[in-house]
């Protein structure tokens, strides 16, 4: 297992609709054809997996149908979008990149992006 540098923004504020996008960029030492990207959430020293996708270079990222993540890839960059976020989901979202094929296997873990989320103000009651 070889180490690889992964860069991501330190802080992102989610939109009022609970959507946050950020780029996860990895310094690929070779010509990987199969890449796995995992998003981990760290909150109060607990780490949980948010979503993961494996993709072939040049193809779209495919997350599970019920995943809250979507993404696109371009070269050594992965543009990740997490939706359905609420205030309670505020936390550090860490990008983990694995170069699966061809060997050697490389692993890189970013420092994390702190995503701040605020619940939208409830709409005032209307008479309609």
């Amino acid at each position: 297992c070889k180490a690889m540098h992964v860069a991501q923004p330190a802080v992102v504020l989610a939109s009022s609709r609970g959507i946050a996008s950020f780029v996860c960029e990895y310094a690929s030492p070779g010509k990987a054809t199969e890449v796995r990207v995992t998003v981990l959430r760290q909150a109060d020293s607990q780490v949980t997996e948010v979503c993961a996708a494996t993709y072939m270079m040049g193809n779209e990222l495919t997350f599970l149908d019920d995943s809250i993540c979507t993404g696109t890839s371009s070269g050594n960059q992965v543009n990740l979008t997490i939706q359905g976020l609420r205030a309670m989901d505020t936390g550090l979202y860490i990008c983990k990149v694995e170069l699966m094929y061809p060997p050697p296997y490389y692993l890189g873990i970013g420092n994390g992006t702190q995503i701040y989320v605020i619940d939208p103000e409830p709409c005032p009651d209307s008479d309609f």
Partner: antibody, heavy 117, light 107 residues
Framework: QVQLVQSGPEVKKPGASVKVSCKAS????????IGWVRQAPGQGLEWMGW????????NYVQKFQGRVTMTTDTSTSTAYMELRSLRSDDTAVYYC??????????WGQGTLVTVSS | EIVLTQSPDFQSVTPKEKVTITCRAS??????LHWYQQKPDQSPKLLIK???QSFSGVPSRFSGSGSGTDFTLTINSLEAEDAATYYC?????????FGPGTKVDIK
């Protein structure tokens, strides 16, 4: 090293607007946010809101909603805070501060805004 | 919004004495509590982040502890240059908030 340099002092009349700038250096501007905090004479620190330089999204404290606008110019690594319909109780030192994972870490030197007729 | 309360409001201390300042949050904020020092006519400076982690360049006499709702800033062996107002700040949820401050002066 991280530096935030703010624009100079302002004297404004009630009802006017003020726009304070904050030029950042020493780090990747778009990786962080810029928050704005004010401090009235002899008082504590009051959080006004912040902007994510990464995507331009903003979060304002309800008290200032509709009266404040925070923007960034990523080409010059500069953040701006505009406060409208100024009142005498808006007289304060206005600070910009970098927002990181651990809240606010680095601060500008402050800009004194005096509202007086 | 999360309300932070600090105690005491004011403390007059002799040099080399130990100072303890507490900050209480109105709800659980985990460890997302940070401490700042502000000297007269200066900008605030970060001392402690995430309740107990010293910020770079901060003297070792400053330390922090706590989690959840109760937090403490300790200055071991106070020095004359530590005369300042100390603020706690939470980044657990938006909007961010500050405590009202604790003024420390030297006897």
């Amino acid at each position: 090293q991280v530096q935030l340099v703010q624009s100079g002092p302002e004297v404004k009349k009630p009802g006017a607007s003020v726009k304070v700038s904050c030029k950042a250096s020493g780090y990747t501007f778009t990786s962080y946010g810029i928050g704005w905090v004010r401090q009235a004479p002899g008082q504590g620190l009051e959080w006004m809101g912040w902007i994510s330089a990464y995507n331009g999204n903003t979060n304002y404290v309800q008290k200032f909603q509709g009266r404040v606008t925070m923007t960034t110019d990523t080409s010059t690594s500069t953040a701006y805070m505009e406060l409208r319909s100024l009142r005498s109780d808006d007289t304060a030192v206005y600070y910009c501060a970098r927002v990181g994972a651990s809240g606010v870490d680095y601060w500008g030197q402050g800009t004194l805004v005096t509202v007086s007729s | 919004e999360i309300v932070l309360t600090q105690s005491p409001d004011f403390q007059s201390v002799t040099p080399k004495e130990k100072v303890t300042i507490t900050c209480r949050a109105s709800q659980n904020i985990g460890s997302s509590l940070h401490w700042y020092q502000q000297k007269p006519d200066q900008s605030p400076k970060l001392l402690i982040k995430y309740a107990s982690q010293s910020f770079s360049g901060v003297p070792s006499r400053f330390s922090g502890s706590g989690s959840g709702t109760d937090f403490t800033l300790t200055i071991n062996s106070l020095e004359a240059e530590d005369a300042a107002t100390y603020y706690c700040h939470q980044s657990s949820s938006l909007p961010f908030t500050f405590g009202p401050g604790t003024k420390v002066d030297i006897k």
